[in-house]
Structure formats: C-alpha cells, structure tokens
C-alpha cells in the first residue's frame, strides 16, 4: 500500500496567517491527491482534487500544489472558519490511503494548567474498581505530561487521557487523566499523586491525597 505522511501534525496560527501543510507519498501518485477539511463531529469536506483543482464552492484562499510524492496545501490568509483538521488522500491506487491529519489550531499565549486530583467515589468502590482522576484546566499549548505515582512508585500502562477541543474563547485546552485500579489494589496503597509537566510551569506540579483522609 502507498503510505501518506503529513507534516506537521499540529500547526498553531493566527487569523490572516499564510499556512502550509505538507503531504508525502511513499511512492509516486502523479497528481492523484485530494485534500479534506474536518471539524469535530462533522464529516470530512472535500476541498481539493487532482492535487490542485478546487472543489466547487471552496474559497480560492485554498491552494494545492505538487506532483509525484510531494504535495502541499496552502491557506493564503487563514480565516476563523479554517481552524480544523486537514487530511490528504491518495487515489492513485485502489487502496485509497489517508494521511494522519494536520490540526490547525489557534495560536494562544502560554497558560499554565490548574491541577486537581479526585479520589474514587465510595459508590464506585462498591463496584470493585477505583478510578483516580487528575484534571488539568485551561492550559496552552496542548502538550502536557501527566505521571502517576502510587506510594511514590511510578505507574505505567494503567491510565488513560482525554483532551478537550480548543476553547473557542480563550484558546486553551483541558485534560483529564484517569488511573484505574482494582479496589483491592487501591486499598493496598496510601499516597496517590499526579505530577504535571507543562511549558507554563517553571517546575512540575504535584497534587496528591492520602487514601482514607479525604
């Protein structure tokens, strides 16, 4: 199969900026390349076909170019409606492969997360499982690292993260990280902590609680 590689994966920009997204094919696809725009909860919208042909109704600020293995999508002057995820797709071969996507986000100012930790509810513990939640609110940029420690021992493989879409008002993100344990394992330990690293923090922030004391 022909693989499609897009770069960058995220692009931070402001209204009026000229932005360029690159798509590379693992072998020549001539000009059999399409570009799509997708917004959260919506179906992909066809923007461009045959590398540089604009789909009907698509604004002329979208410009496609390239042939062979290297292609670009340029937005000549970014508009508020253009903040979305963009995908390239080859249709040179029957297995029509998509790129992994480029998210065009609003460029914000660095903001440190507010960090909170929540123990499992008594109600949940009755069911035999325990979820500890670490919440990071209103931060920018999106990259944030959460590490879980139980009695100071680093945890791995037993947590899941979920990140919100960018807030339309202040351009920030929020994230929740959930550490899931069995009730039996949860009750074997005392100190539960999440450690957060982010560009807006001069040093990592740790929030913790002692089981049974909150």
């Amino acid at each position: 199969d022909i693989q499609m590689t897009q770069s960058p994966s995220t692009l931070s920009a402001s209204v009026g900026d000229r932005v360029t997204i690159t798509c590379r094919a693992s072998q020549s696809i001539n000009t059999w390349l399409a570009w799509y725009q997708q917004k959260p909860g919506k179906a992909p919208k066809l923007l461009m076909y045959k590398a540089s042909s604009l789909e009907s109704g698509v604004p002329s600020r979208f410009i496609g170019s390239g042939s062979g293995t290297e292609f670009t999508l340029t937005i000549s002057s970014l508009q508020p409606d253009d903040f979305a995820t963009y995908y390239c797709q080859q249709y040179n071969s029957d297995s029509k492969m998509f790129g992994q996507g480029t998210k065009v986000e609003v460029k914000g100012t660095v903001a440190a997360p507010s960090v909170f930790i929540f123990p499992p509810s008594d109600e949940q513990l009755k069911s035999g499982t325990a979820s500890v939640v670490c919440l990071l609110n209103n931060f920018y940029p999106r990259e944030a690292k959460v590490q879980w420690k139980v009695d100071n021992a680093l945890q791995s493989g037993n947590s899941q993260e979920s990140v919100t879409e960018q807030d339309s008002k202040d351009s920030t993100y929020s994230l929740s990280s959930t550490l899931t344990l069995s009730k039996a394992d949860y009750e074997k330990h005392k100190v539960y902590a999440c450690e957060v690293t982010h560009q807006g923090l001069s040093s990592p922030v740790t929030k913790s609680f002692n089981r049974g004391e909150c």
């Epitope: 066809l46 249709y91 029509k96």
Partner: nanobody, 121 residues
Framework: QVQLQESGGGLVQAGGSLRLSCAAS????????MSWFRQAPGKEREFVAV????????FYSDSAEGRFTVSRDDAKNTVYLQMNSLKPEDTAVYYC??????????????WGQGTQVTVSS
C-alpha cells in the same frame, strides 16, 4: 442535501459476524461507486472496500479480502458490508462514502457519521 446513514455496528466476539448498512438519501447511488472506510483510535482513516456501479464488481483492502463482502441494492439506495470472522483488530468506527463523480474518481464529497464496531477477544 445528500445524507448517508450507517447502521448495524455493535459489540461482537472474535470470530463473529456483523452486517453494516449505509442508506443514502438526496442522491441516486446507482451511478456512483460506494466505499467503506474505517478508523481506529489514533490511526489513519483506512479504506476497506468499494462497491462499484452495478455489474462492475468490488474491490477490497488486503485486511478485508476473503472475510468481508460489499454489496449494494440500488433500488433501496443502500450499500452493505457483511463482515465475517471478525478479529479484535477490526475494532473501529466504520464509515461509508460516495464518490464525488460518476467516473470512479476515488474522491468523496459525502460521508456518513459512522457506526462503531467493537470486537472483543
């Protein structure tokens, strides 16, 4: 306005079967190729199968070949994906899409919202 509505997804055990449907409205599908794609969390959207215009046959991805069958009922304006011998790696949201023109362009101007298929081991 063209609309595509998938249905038939669900939770199934490995080795089991599901039949997905995609009902189209706003466009007569008989002149268009209809495709199925899928997307697993954190992965690219992946081509699964295409039902070309009636009489022109079908094409499958390597992962779908021999296990999945795509068919169409132009009278009902509906395309189907019969999935047999399902594996945990088939877990994904499955989407149908209609070609943007009648000449097998392989570009898609309308997509469904997707139906979740979860295969447990």
């Amino acid at each position: 306005q063209v609309q595509l509505q998938e249905s038939g997804g669900g939770l199934v055990q490995a080795g089991g079967s599901l039949r997905l449907s995609c009902a189209a409205s706003g466009r007569t599908i008989s002149r268009y190729a209809m495709s199925w794609f899928r997307q697993a969390p954190g992965k690219e959207r992946e081509f699964v199968a295409v039902a070309r215009r009636s009489g022109d046959g079908a094409f499958y991805s390597d992962s779908a070949e021999g296990r999945f069958t795509v068919s169409r009922d132009d009278a009902k304006n509906t395309v189907y994906l019969q999935m047999n011998s399902l594996k945990p790696e088939d877990t994904a949201v499955y989407y149908c899409a209609i070609d943007s023109s009648t000449d097998y362009t392989g570009t898609y101007d309308y997509w469904g919202q997707g139906t979740q298929v979860t295969v447990s081991s």
